[in-house]
């Protein structure tokens, strides 16, 4: 039975050229997290954090993606094309798979503010 809940940073905005932290947190379960996958809106994998192997950043994103903090992901040198959905997938045992969604809006405006609130999708 899956009792856990994924909390995410929800809908966030950040400035073009800036950086942003994508963060998910799994709570309310004692399940063991074996791997966390981070995917972009087009379902391409950005990065994987395997509990045993550590972080793997996919080659296409190595210049602009940094692991962490924690199980989160930092996107750097943001472009307008980075606007869209991002998904964290927690592979756990014995529960199975949990998935969280974050929507990132990259703004041209210099007044864009990065909201860091956590919310349950």
């Amino acid at each position: 039975m899956m009792t856990g809940t994924i909390e995410t940073t929800g809908n966030i905005s950040a400035k073009k050229g800036g950086s942003v932290i994508l963060q998910c947190h799994l709570s309310s379960t004692m399940a063991q997290v074996t791997q966390v996958n981070w995917e972009q809106h087009d379902h391409s994998l950005l990065a994987i954090r395997n509990a045993e192997l550590g972080w793997h950043i996919y080659p296409a994103f190595k210049d602009r993606v940094a692991p962490g903090p924690g199980l989160g992901l930092t996107l750097q040198s943001l472009t307008m094309n980075d606007t869209g959905e991002y998904f964290c997938t927690y592979h756990t045992y014995p529960d199975g798979t949990y998935r969280g969604r974050i929507f990132l809006e990259v703004l041209e405006s210099s007044v864009a503010e990065h909201s860091a609130r956590f919310q349950i999708p």
């Epitope: 074996t34 791997q35 395997n50 080659p59 756990t92 045992y93 014995p94």
Partner: antibody
Framework: EVQLLESGGGLVQPGGSLRLSCAAS????????MSWVRQAPGKGLEWVSA????????WYADSVKGRFTISRDNSKNTLYLQMNSLRAEDTAVYYC?????????????????WGQGTLVTVSS | EIVMTQSPATLSVSPGERATLSCRAS??????LAWYQQKPGQAPRLLIY???TRATGIPARFSGSGSGTEFTLTISSLQSEDFAVYYC??????????FGGGTKVEIK
């Protein structure tokens, strides 16, 4: 700390049988894929067989297909390799190794954690 | 079966020097390539996976590169503990998963 301890090796005549065991500790055994990899004396590494976390799926190298059977008992945290119709070319150190992946994440078929190995000698 | 070929068979290097090891696949394995180090009487140790990603705890002097059929393991400045045999292994998503014949890195 992850530990894998193989046992069951020894001297056996050609055509004979042997059952290897690998006792796992220090991690939750159930979800992880496991493999057997062997190394003939003074030679390189050869993947032998792999098994999924549940034990429902198994894979074999052509050189052992039909003669070797991989299995696991998750309640005992133990991996097995039943070896029948043994040949001189099966002489090797047999390692059990843990896959970093699970059924949910997918298996990698690479191995960070290995046992110390057990020597199987097939000779008359 | 995908055949993995390593070269050279033996590499003689002085401590502190750079070592470059090659691995070639008989057909494309994309980036599904790992490198292991093995010392006498010991089990292999995973160094690199996905062709270029260091496994947890592996020193930065080890680096991997390549994709498709041509791969390289570079040890930037050899330490005394790096003298060993190195194996490449392909792990395309279907078996068999094959190793190269190994490269022995010895003290010059």
């Amino acid at each position: 700390e992850v530990q894998l301890l193989e046992s069951g090796g020894g001297l056996v005549q050609p055509g004979g049988s042997l059952r290897l065991s690998c006792a796992a500790s220090g991690f939750t055994f159930g979800p992880y894929g496991m493999s057997w990899v062997r190394q003939a004396p003074g030679k390189g590494l050869e993947w032998v067989s792999a098994i999924s976390g549940s034990g429902a799926s198994t894979w074999y190298a052509d050189s052992v297909k039909g003669r070797f059977t991989i299995s696991r008992d998750n309640s005992k945290n133990t991996l097995y390799l039943q070896m029948n119709s043994l040949r001189a070319e099966d002489t090797a150190v047999y390692y059990c190794a843990k896959d970093p992946g699970t059924h949910y994440s997918g298996y990698y078929y690479i191995w960070r954690y290995w046992g110390q190995g057990t020597l199987v000698t097939v000779s008359s | 079966e995908i055949v993995m070929t390593q070269s050279p068979a033996t590499l003689s290097v002085s401590p502190g020097e750079r070592a470059t090891l090659s691995c070639r696949a008989s057909q494309s394995v994309s980036s599904n390539l790992a490198w292991y180090q093995q010392k006498p009487g010991q089990a292999p140790r995973l160094l690199i996976y996905s062709a270029s990603t260091r496994a947890t705890g592996i020193p930065a002097r080890f680096s991997g590169s390549g994709s498709g059929t041509e791969f390289t393991l570079t040890i930037s400045s050899l330490q005394s503990e790096d003298f060993a045999v190195y194996y490449c292994q392909q792990y395309v998503p279907h078996p068999p998963f094959t190793f190269g014949g190994g490269t022995k890195v010895e003290i010059k």
